[in-house]
């Protein structure tokens, strides 16, 4: 033979301002006879919610039908949540008394507490690009949440980063929290087309997290090799020198060549190709006039990337001497 | 229509124990409180306890705690009184009685009544 | 617990008498809590009136209950042969529901 019981499932109900919060309430028996009020808080001062018998309760609605026999669901709906709403919310059956009714049981209870959602992680980058095998810090904010509980995870590429510091502020009571996450993310030369995830989970989201990228294209630098080499055939007097930058990234790139220390002035042809992880082949051609005047060419390919201390790479010009009498043959 | 039907007279000896019956008909018997209700000869009515037989709950006079357990059957739409350590004060009629409705207390069906007597 | 008194215990009346007999509460009884039954002699009880002053199914319109608070009344506005029998008070306002003494109606 069982007692009846008092049953209201949720210990925390979370809502938002201006909605609609239900507060569930079923008992598990009719006896003994009487009815079931809603309170707010205990003890002498408590708010009476909902008294179905009697009192004004223009917010209050029942989600059962009272009037309906062996009813045993006394949930109900208030309207038009406000901050003064929050507290802790108890069904209370009681017993049909003389003079009064007498207090039977009460439910657990349910705390009705505001939620607000977080807002959308916004995260930012270092300010200034690095390069591979070195660490960048990326910052991971949102704001305005409640409760104050929240998870906050990072990825890169789709694998959890452990190398993070996360705080919570304020520390104590507030109507609204905010969250500061910094990862710390070393980068990989393949990282260009490599994302960085901060996912923030809270109850108010119903197991959708937020989530925030950055781009470590953004963070990254990826230096360029050089290699310059003389292409085996010439044409007519003309030697034909080959620049090649090979996987640089950001595109951003000033190539000049020099002959004997003397900058070139005139066009060169290029080409600029993408690699599959998004760093950049830049090749350059140098066509060099060769005279018999001319015994010792040097070619120097100088490349300044992305702003950074120009890097150049050097070639001793290889003319043999049949080159020459053929170019002597060429002179007017 | 609704009817109460109980069970016939008992003539126990004290000290024993005796279980008396009350079958429903003509309505859901599991939606409707049942209580029952003590009559000593030449006396009034003093109510015992009741129960819920949709949950098989019960509510007892505090007078009769101990004395009465009340009990109900939903296959067979019966609900028991059992009475124990029997004297003579237990001699009575007793009647099983149905509310109109959960929210109007008063005894709209009765039984018939069945008269215990308790004799050595 | 309530304590229902009812007076008188007895009355004899004639045939066509008006009859009035009363149920006093030891605690104030809402007037939708407040029942009238009658019982004769070998027979279980029948209602008579419910809720103060509403007449249960196929009770005559002679009846009548009246009151409030904690003090309630039954009225046979003429008395017929038939009406002999001893009628309770009941409450259903707080646990323990009980019942008054009675009043044996006992016609002349």
């Known amino acids: 033979e069982e007692e009846l019981q008092m049953i209201q499932p949720e210990k925390l109900l979370l809502v938002t301002v201006g909605k609609t919060a239900t507060l569930h309430c079923t008992v598990t028996s009719l006896l003994p006879v009487g009815p079931v009020l809603w309170f707010r808080g205990v003890g002498p001062g408590r708010e009476l919610i909902y008294n179905q018998k009697e009192g004004h309760f223009p917010r209050v609605t029942t989600v059962s039908d009272l009037t309906k026999r062996n009813n045993m669901d006394f949930s109900i709906r208030i309207s038009s949540i406000t901050p003064a709403d929050v507290g802790t919310y108890y069904c209370v059956k009681f017993r049909k008394g003389s003079p009064e009714n007498v207090e039977f049981k009460s439910g657990p209870g349910t705390e009705m507490a505001l939620g607000a959602k977080p807002s959308a992680p916004v995260v930012l980058g270092p300010a200034a690009r690095t390069t591979p095998e070195h660490t960048v810090s990326f910052t991971c904010e949102s704001h305005g949440f409640s409760p104050r509980d929240i998870t906050l995870k990072w990825f890169k590429n789709g694998n959890e980063l452990s190398d993070f510091q996360t705080n919570v502020d304020p520390t104590g009571q507030s109507v609204a929290y905010s969250i500061r996450s910094t990862a710390r993310v070393v980068l990989d030369p393949w990282d260009v087309r490599s994302q960085v995830i901060c996912e923030v989970a809270h109850v108010t989201l119903q197991g959708d997290p937020l989530r925030g990228t950055a781009n470590l294209s953004e963070a990254i630098r990826v230096p360029p090799t050089l290699e310059v080499t003389q292409q085996p055939m010439r044409v007519g007097n003309q030697v034909n020198v080959t620049c090649q930058v090979r996987k640089f990234y950001p595109q951003s790139l000033q190539l000049t060549w020099s002959e004997n220390g003397n900058v070139c002035q005139r066009e060169t042809a290029s080409t600029l190709t993408e690699n599959k992880d998004g760093t950049y082949n830049w090749t350059s051609w140098f066509l060099v006039n060769i005279s018999d005047q001319r015994d010792d060419v040097v070619l120097t390919c100088q490349v300044k990337h992305d702003g950074q201390l120009a890097v150049s790479k050097r070639l001793a010009l290889e003319v043999t001497v049949h080159q020459k009498d053929q170019s002597s043959d060429a002179t007017p | 229509q609704v009817q109460l039907q109980q069970s016939g007279p008992e003539l126990v000896k004290p000290g024993a124990s005796v279980k008396m019956s009350c079958k429903a008909s003509?309505?859901?018997?599991?939606?409707?409180?049942l209580s029952w209700v003590k009559q000593r000869t030449g006396q009034g009515l003093e109510w015992i306890g009741e129960i819920y037989p949709g949950t098989i709950t019960t509510y007892y006079n505090e007078k009769f705690k101990g004395k009465a357990t009340l009990t109900a059957d939903k296959s067979s739409n019966t609900a028991y009184i059992q009475l124990t350590s029997l004297t003579s004060e237990d001699s009575a009629v007793y009647f099983c009685g149905r509310f109109y409705d959960y929210d109007g207390g008063w005894f709209a069906y009765w039984g018939q009544g069945t008269l215990l007597t308790v004799s050595a | 617990e309530n304590v229902l008194t009812q007076s008188p215990e007895k009355m004899a009346v004639s045939l066509g008498q008006k009859v009035t007999m009363t149920c006093s509460a030891s605690?104030?009884?809402?007037?939708?809590?407040l029942h009238w039954y009658q019982q004769k002699s070998g027979a279980s009880p029948k209602p008579l009136i419910h809720g103060t002053s509403n007449l249960a199914s196929g009770v005559p319109a002679r009846f009548s209950g009246s009151g409030s608070g904690t003090s309630y009344s039954l009225t046979i506005s003429s008395v017929e042969a038939e009406d002999a029998a001893t009628y309770y008070c009941q409450q259903w306002s707080g646990y323990p529901w009980t019942f008054g003494g009675g009043t044996n109606l006992e016609i002349k």
């Open positions: 605690s104030s009884v809402s007037s939708s809590d």
């Open positions: 003509g309505y859901t018997f599991s939606e409707y409180v």
